[in-house]
């Protein structure tokens, strides 16, 4: 029953959540763990917030929107497969078993482009070797590595494809919001 | 606003099934734990099981012996209570609550034949 | 399971007296201890969580203390709508467990 989001080895994963502060500034303690939410607070917690602050973070786990107006969304930075599976977002409210628990599903799935190791040229000098992708927050990036012999249209059609796989998972329009107070 | 409203039959035989309703509305029902706790007539509170929407996640006041069975509809907000094989014992307020903080009214059961 | 042992059962009080309520977990509960207030024919309402927060809205004449397995209730001043039964509650693990309660009423 957990809503499903998807990301490609390599690129960051967005899982979306929200709450609305019912102040500004009346920021109220968030969890995110690895997998479901249990009872009480979160297990295996990779990132905290408390009414003030992000207080604890772990590599490639962080928030990029603004917590303090209520966007609490992870991003986790280059994924990989080991990656897949349910995450925990708890909106810690103040109160007896009062929090709102979010468990959203990440789903990874190999990279699009894996180009075969043929002949090896070094294309640094004519491209970057990293073509920017479309996301959330600082520009994403996917590592090409050795390409084989392609033209230069063969590489914006590339880059297109990998912008337009990231824009396919762009998952602005959905994500749990809840109201406080 | 966050509102609980239990419902049910006010009259049960004895070692039928209880049944009750809770339906939630004013917050995101999937998201918080729902609490189902009995008050006897002029008695303490009795807490009887909780469950989380989001998964369906339960757990169960052993006193209860297994008689209990807690679910949800999601589709209609609503929570459920079954209580099997009543005795006289089990008449009763009922409430649910979301989490403890926010309480239905209650709705009174008695059990008789 | 975790008991939990509440005291006095019953007590009376003038308008405007201190009055103190105890609660004993069998075991440590890590402040994971509620106090609620029930009046005759209505819900349990939530004063405290977490042994010592008041919650938002309740009046300041009440509070909570304590830790490990004792824990105290106190109405500072006492007015006469705080008429009612109240109940302690322990929610560090399943399943949750009630005081057995102390009625509050006015001499």
């Known amino acids: 029953s957990e809503v499903e989001y998807r990301a490609e080895v390599g690129q960051n994963a967005y899982l979306p959540c929200f709450y609305t502060p019912a102040a500004p500034g009346n920021l109220v303690p968030v969890c995110w763990g690895k997998g479901a939410c249990p009872v009480f607070e979160c297990g295996n917690v990779v990132l905290r917030t408390d009414e003030r602050d992000v207080n604890y973070w772990t590599s490639r786990y962080w928030l990029n929107g603004d917590f303090r107006k209520g966007d609490v969304s992870l991003t986790i930075e280059n994924v990989t497969l080991a990656d897949s599976g349910i995450y925990c977002c708890r909106i810690q409210i103040p109160g007896i078993m009062n929090d709102e628990k979010f468990n959203l599903k990440l789903v990874i799935k190999p990279a699009k482009v894996t180009p075969a190791p043929t002949r090896q040229r070094d294309f640094t000098a004519a491209f970057p070797r990293m073509l920017t992708t479309r996301g959330h927050g600082p520009a994403e990036t996917q590592t090409l590595g050795s390409l084989p012999d392609i033209n230069l249209t063969q590489i914006s059609t590339l880059a297109n494809e990998l912008r337009d796989s990231r824009l396919a998972n762009d998952l602005r329009d959905s994500g749990a919001t809840i109201r406080i107070g | 606003q966050v509102q609980l409203q239990e419902s049910g039959p006010g009259l049960v035989k004895p070692s039928e099934t209880l049944s009750l309703t809770c339906k939630a509305s004013g917050y995101t029902f999937t998201s918080s734990d729902i609490n189902w706790v009995r008050q006897p007539p002029g008695k303490g509170l009795e807490w009887i099981g909780w469950i989380f929407p989001g998964d369906g996640s339960t757990k169960y006041n052993p006193s209860l012996k297994s008689r209990a069975t807690l679910s949800t509809d999601k589709s209609k907000n609503q929570a459920s209570l079954n209580l099997s094989s009543v005795t006289a014992a089990d008449t009763a307020v009922y409430f649910c609550?979301?989490?403890?903080?926010?309480w239905g009214k209650g709705t009174t059961v008695t059990v008789s034949s | 399971d975790i008991q939990m042992t509440q005291s006095p059962s019953s007590l009376s009080a003038s308008v405007g007296d201190r009055v103190t309520i105890t609660c004993k977990a069998s075991q440590d509960i890590n402040s994971y201890l509620g106090w609620f207030q029930q009046k005759p024919g209505k819900a349990p309402k939530t004063l405290i969580y977490?042994?010592?927060r008041l919650v938002d809205g309740v009046p300041s004449r009440f509070s909570g203390s304590g830790s490990g397995q004792d824990y105290t209730f106190t109405i500072s001043s006492l007015q006469p709508e705080d008429i009612a039964t109240y109940y302690c509650?322990?929610?560090?693990?399943?399943?949750?467990?009630f005081g057995p309660g102390t009625k509050v009423d006015i001499k």
């Open positions: 609550a979301r989490g403890l903080d926010y």
């Open positions: 977490r042994a010592d």
């Open positions: 509650l322990q929610y560090d693990e399943f399943p949750l467990t």
